[in-house]
Interface confidence: low
């Protein structure tokens, strides 16, 4: 068996730090066997079998010119193997941030705080923080740690599924390279990192006979749970074409009638979402949708769609130890602003 411990990384590669003494190990011999060392591509003997260093090559104060492939051979000329020296630095604590697009799952991303120049991997785990007793924090099996599964495509991201909205979590991201490991711990709560995805399916339609009205409608983002315990509130902005300033309203539901549109001009509309009890932050804005008020006279009767509709209440779920949150579906306000005459 080889006398050389295999560091994590590609086979046949050994590692060192610039400015430090580096020992290279001849992999194909018995420990202590005297070997000759050559730099690949050059016949010059770097270290002979009489060095007293056995199967190792010592490079004092290695620098970038020492990087490359080395060849060792035994006394009888048998090839002992090839070793590639790669210089770099031990890991530094990675930069970690976490975000949630819904209240049941969150993801964490990371990046190196320093470039090590070496093959690097990341170990990701998390645990739920619980306090048992008055003055001590102890671990129980239900608190982890558990692995935070990483994206299969190699993106620097892991996802925690089935998180509890009211719990605190400690994320552990450890950067590992052949020269060591370094850990970043990050405490997160879903409430503080919640940022929904923007609403989807934004449509802007004219209201026949109302030259200053536009009707906007949208849906919850697909990433928000289908039967939500927690609702979203919305913020809608609109402006006529070529006007720099946005007007902002906070609709009560999934549609809004704008009553002060500029007749005859196309309008841009966009919408943003946030947890309805103000956890986390507002989403980014949805892509803009455009609409132009209709031309024509006001009809004598309010069309059927203009009547107020209510949605049935959603029963709060009580299978969670979390305090219940109000879960009424707000009434959509269709005709909430008086038309300017």
């Amino acid at each position: 068996s080889s006398p050389c411990p295999q560091a994590w990384g590609p086979p046949g590669v050994q590692y060192g730090q610039p400015g430090r003494s580096v020992k290279l190990c001849c992999p194909g011999v018995t420990a202590g066997d005297p070997v000759s060392w050559f730099r690949d591509g050059e016949p010059k003997l770097l270290q002979g079998p009489d060095s007293g260093l056995g199967h190792e090559l010592v490079l004092a104060q290695a620098d970038s010119t020492d990087e490359g492939t080395y060849i060792c051979q035994t006394l009888d000329g048998a090839l002992g193997g090839t070793v590639t020296l790669q210089l770099g630095y031990p890991p530094a604590r990675p930069v970690v941030s976490c975000q949630a697009a819904d209240y049941e799952n969150f993801s964490c991303t990371w990046s190196p705080s320093q470039i090590s120049g070496l093959p690097t991997r990341y170990l990701t785990s998390y645990r739920k923080k619980t306090v048992l007793g008055a003055d001590s924090q102890r671990r129980s099996p239900s608190t982890g740690p558990w692995p935070c599964p990483q994206d299969p495509l190699g993106a620097a991201r892991c996802v925690v599924h089935g998180a509890e909205f009211w719990s605190q979590y400690r994320i552990n991201v450890t950067e590992v390279n052949p020269l060591g490991a370094s850990t970043r711990l990050l405490d997160v709560s879903l409430q503080s990192i919640l940022r929904p995805d923007p609403p989807q399916g934004l449509r802007v339609e004219s209201v026949p006979g109302y030259p200053r009205r536009l009707r906007a409608s949208w849906t919850y983002p697909a990433s928000w749970p289908c039967q939500p315990h927690f609702l979203l509130k919305f913020r809608l902005q609109y402006r006529p074409a070529q006007h720099p300033a946005w007007s902002t309203v906070e609709p009560a539901g999934l549609e809004e009638v704008i009553t002060d549109a500029v007749a005859g001009l196309p309008h841009a509309v966009r919408v943003s979402a946030r947890d309805f009890l103000d956890a986390g932050t507002w989403s980014t804005w949805s892509p803009e949708a455009w609409g132009t008020p209709s031309t024509g006279t006001i009809p004598k009767e309010i069309p059927a769609w203009g009547q107020l509709h209510t949605q049935p209440e959603v029963e709060p779920q009580v299978d969670s130890p979390a305090p219940p949150r109000p879960s009424l579906q707000p009434h959509p306000r269709l005709l909430d602003h008086r038309d300017s005459v």
Epitope: D40, G41, E42, P43, T69, A78, L79, T82
Partner: antibody, heavy 117, light 107 residues
């Protein structure tokens, strides 16, 4: 650019010796190993051995050890390979190749040695 | 001596196709395996060193993989000039030895 120019074709009788030369240019001759290889007609490649031009340290394939001698003349940047006790199965194209310690990066054009009675 | 066995002996493919050539060693040689291309009447040319390391001036369509005893040379999309004989060579122990070659011919 790196160039390896070999001596011309040879016809030898069984039992004789042949000495093939390889003149190097375009690089520092004493920095690289010189390998010798051969390829019999329609066959694969066979490594004969190598020599370190700076110290003339050689490694020979055991198959040829008793019949091959590799030398260098640093003053003319020329490497030589002599094979003795030739037999018909030594008929082949013989190549010199400048290499890393174990690789063959630049090749001569080849020298055909025919052994025939 | 370490014996290298290449397969197949002959591979018939068309330009644009992907070629996969195999080389198996009689004992583990780590990554000390190299690939050469030889065209009729020419000396061999080094394509890949140490199983997977590319060589300057060699087109990116040539790649290598493997470690231990099983190695592969892949040509992602064959060009007309790629039809030749390919040899693997080991540098794990003396004597340095070659496979018997794979002839890549136009179908």
């Amino acid at each position: 650019q790196v160039q390896l120019v070999q001596s011309g074709a040879e016809v030898k009788k069984p039992g004789a010796s042949v000495k093939v030369s390889c003149k190097a240019s375009g690089y520092t001759f004493t920095n690289y190993w010189m390998h010798w290889l051969r390829q019999r007609p329609g066959q694969g490649l066979e490594w004969i051995g190598n020599i370190g031009p700076s110290d003339s340290k050689t490694h020979y394939n055991q198959k040829f050890k008793d019949r091959v001698t590799m030398t260098v003349d640093k003053s003319t940047s020329t490497a030589y390979m002599e094979l003795s006790s030739l037999r018909s199965e030594d008929t082949a194209v013989y190549y010199c190749a400048r290499g890393d310690y174990v690789l063959f990066t630049y090749w001569g054009q080849g020298t055909l040695v025919t052994v025939s009675s | 001596d370490i014996v290298l066995t290449q397969s197949p002996a002959t591979l018939s493919l068309s330009p644009g196709e992907r070629a996969t050539l195999s080389c198996r060693a009689s004992q583990s040689i780590s990554n000390n395996l190299h690939w050469y291309q030889q065209k009729p009447g020419q000396a061999p040319r080094l394509l890949i060193k140490y199983a997977s390391q590319s060589i300057s001036g060699i087109p990116a369509r040539f790649s290598g993989s493997g470690s231990g005893t099983d190695f592969t040379l892949t040509i992602s999309s064959l060009e007309p000039e790629d039809f030749a004989v390919y040899f693997c060579q080991q540098s794990y122990s003396w004597p340095l030895t070659f496979g018997q070659g794979t002839k890549l011919e136009i179908k």
